[in-house]
């Protein structure tokens, strides 16, 4: 389970455009062994983006998240800065992958589907802990995400690494309870599901889920990127992870060269990912999109799939 401590398993070749720190909940640094240093930002919607640590907005965002983490600690929350091998997060189960990301599987397994079960990690996240932080990075927990420019005009020019599926129930939250807010993001053309970040202790009532509706492409999301237009995303869902295509839909069209390599270390059977898989069905990549990697989801700590559409996710709940 503990693969090479020094191996670089997240490399970024394309950096995201600016993201409001209000949309971020966490950051981590990739390892020195990756050569090109990058900050991995996690948004309220549990999407990961590569960011350039030399950019002022990234420095400001990290500083802001550090302050928030310190405040959480002072207020009774716990926070761990972890330094060491970057392991895959065990919390997420499914997600969208941006074209600049490639998975480098390190093992194969016998089953082709991942069925994570919920755990107490949501509650831990809500209380400010970071149980699923990859070790091997310097990280910080912060708060929530989202803005939206004009009518569907693309997303941050960035590299979304993974995305965790959301739930579609609504709950009541008392303002006095600590929590990590829900989703909000710019970068994807077609979904805006919410992650299951509800704090059970504050969930007063659960509303019924909405009936599936027609999807407006990139509804709920506008874009930070400068004028790039998103390509409408197909409803990307799959059960078996075959070749993983570059996932650029909501971003600028990047060439095949703009990929980040992500080596995902297998998760042991004791791992308890805390979210339900978002995808089922199959999907064929568009011909013009280069195929970057293949992998066996059974052994991956992070199941990476192109981002599914929100209503499809709702139908599966």
């Amino acid at each position: 389970q503990h693969h090479g401590v020094t191996k670089c398993n997240i490399t970024c070749s394309k950096m995201t455009s600016k993201i409001p720190v209000a949309l971020l909940i966490h950051y981590q640094q990739n390892q020195a062994s990756c050569g090109k240093r990058a900050i991995i930002l996690e948004t309220r919607q549990h999407r990961l983006f590569c960011a350039d640590p030399k950019e002022q907005w990234v420095k400001d965002a990290m500083q802001h998240l550090d302050r928030q983490a310190a405040a959480l600690t002072r207020n009774g929350g716990t926070f761990e800065k972890q330094i060491g091998e970057v392991k895959p997060r065990t919390t997420p189960a499914a997600g969208g992958m941006d074209e600049s990301v490639v998975l480098e599987p390190e093992a194969t397994g016998e089953s082709s589907s991942l069925e994570p079960t919920p755990s107490s990690q949501e509650a831990q996240r809500a209380l400010g802990t970071s149980p699923e932080l990859p070790t091997g990075v310097t990280g910080s927990s912060g708060t929530r995400l989202p803005p939206t420019p004009k009518a569907q005009d693309g997303g941050p020019v960035g590299t979304e690494l993974f995305r965790v599926p959301p739930v579609s129930t609504a709950a009541t939250w008392q303002s006095s309870a600590p929590h990590q807010p829900g989703p909000s993001l710019w970068a994807e053309a077609k979904t805006s599901e919410a992650p299951s970040t509800q704090d059970p202790s504050t969930q007063a009532s659960t509303a019924s889920s909405p009936a599936p509706e027609e999807n407006a492409p990139s509804e709920g999301q506008r874009v930070w990127g400068q004028g790039q237009s998103p390509r409408p995303e197909n409803s990307l869902e799959r059960e078996e992870m075959g070749p993983v295509p570059a996932h650029t839909d909501a971003f600028q069209d990047w060439g095949p060269g703009s990929m980040a390599h992500v080596s995902v270390v297998p998760v042991s059977s004791e791992g308890t990912p805390s979210r339900e898989p978002v995808a089922s069905g199959s999907w064929t990549p568009k011909a013009e999109e280069p195929i970057h990697a293949t992998m066996d989801p059974q052994r991956l700590g992070v199941l990476i799939t192109p981002v599914p559409d929100a209503q499809a996710a709702t139908r599966r709940q």
Epitope: K18, P20, V21, A22, L23, Q45, Q56, W57, D60, H64, T143, R144, L145, P146, P147, T148, P149, G155, P156, P166, V167, S168, T169, A170, A171, T172, W173, S175, H179, Q180, P181, G182, P183, S184, L185, W186, A187, S192, E193, A194, P195, S196, T197, Q198, Q203, T206, A207, P210, E213, N215, A216, E219, G220, Q221, R222, V223, W224, A310, Q311, T314
Partner: antibody, heavy 119, light 107 residues
């Protein structure tokens, strides 16, 4: 077209609570945030917090923590904001506003609900 | 918290005038700024986000610019329907904060 329709004016006594509703239509309710913003008479705008109807998660301005509850009913596409322990300085027009998931600006607003707190 | 300071608090102008409203943030908000227009008794109307991107349906006489802590909203040729109060809002970090408003009145 996108519309946010709020409940009617309320007059409350100090110490009481008020619950304002905001019914959304014309878009997928669970795909956007609902923010609450207030405006005291002749004053500027003050952000109270948001709720994400997709999962019910909220975020509050620290100034309102502890006496604000936000809820969302996805079956009726309605968001609610309840403010308790009212004081005279809570007299204001309360607006709900839709926020995209890529940033917290407010692209559509409800018409406002006037809340008057007076003994 | 980031404080937003708008200037001037009010101005008088005539139809056809070029009007500039300034918003200064107490910290770097990295262009995550929105502008709204509000008329008496009405809800604010969304004009601009990300410092310079016009919202749908907003006339091109409106434009935004700026960076760091200093931002401006310009109306190139004031129209009768533009007489209103304008607010800026930062959405870089929570709590989201608004400027105090600039009232544009008829001269």
């Amino acid at each position: 077209q996108v519309q946010l329709v709020q409940s009617g004016a309320e007059v409350k006594k100090p110490g009481a609570s008020v619950k304002v509703s905001c019914k959304a239509s014309g878009y997928t309710f669970t795909n956007y945030y609902i923010h609450w913003v207030r405006q005291a008479p002749g004053q500027g705008l003050e952000w109270i917090g948001w709720i994400y109807p997709g999962d019910g998660s909220p975020k509050f301005n620290e100034r309102f923590k502890g006496r604000t509850t936000m809820t969302a009913d996805t079956s009726t596409s309605t968001a609610y904001m309840e403010l308790s322990s009212l004081r005279s300085e809570d007299t204001a027009v309360y607006f709900c506003a839709r926020g995209p998931t890529d940033g917290d600006y407010f692209d559509y607003w409800g018409q406002g609900t006037t809340v008057t707190v007076s003994s | 918290d980031i404080q937003m300071t708008q200037s001037p608090s009010s101005l008088s102008a005539s139809v056809g005038d070029r009007v500039t409203i300034t918003c200064r943030a107490s910290g770097n908000i990295h262009n995550f700024l929105a502008w709204y227009q509000q008329k008496p008794g009405k809800a604010p109307k969304f004009l601009v986000y990300n410092e310079k991107t016009l919202a749908d349906g907003v006339p091109s006489r409106f434009s935004g610019s700026g960076s760091g802590t200093q931002y401006t909203l310009t109306i190139s040729s004031l129209q009768p329907e533009d007489f209103a109060t304008y607010f800026c809002q930062q959405f870089w970090s929570t709590p989201y904060t608004f400027g105090g408003g600039t009232k544009v009145e008829i001269k």
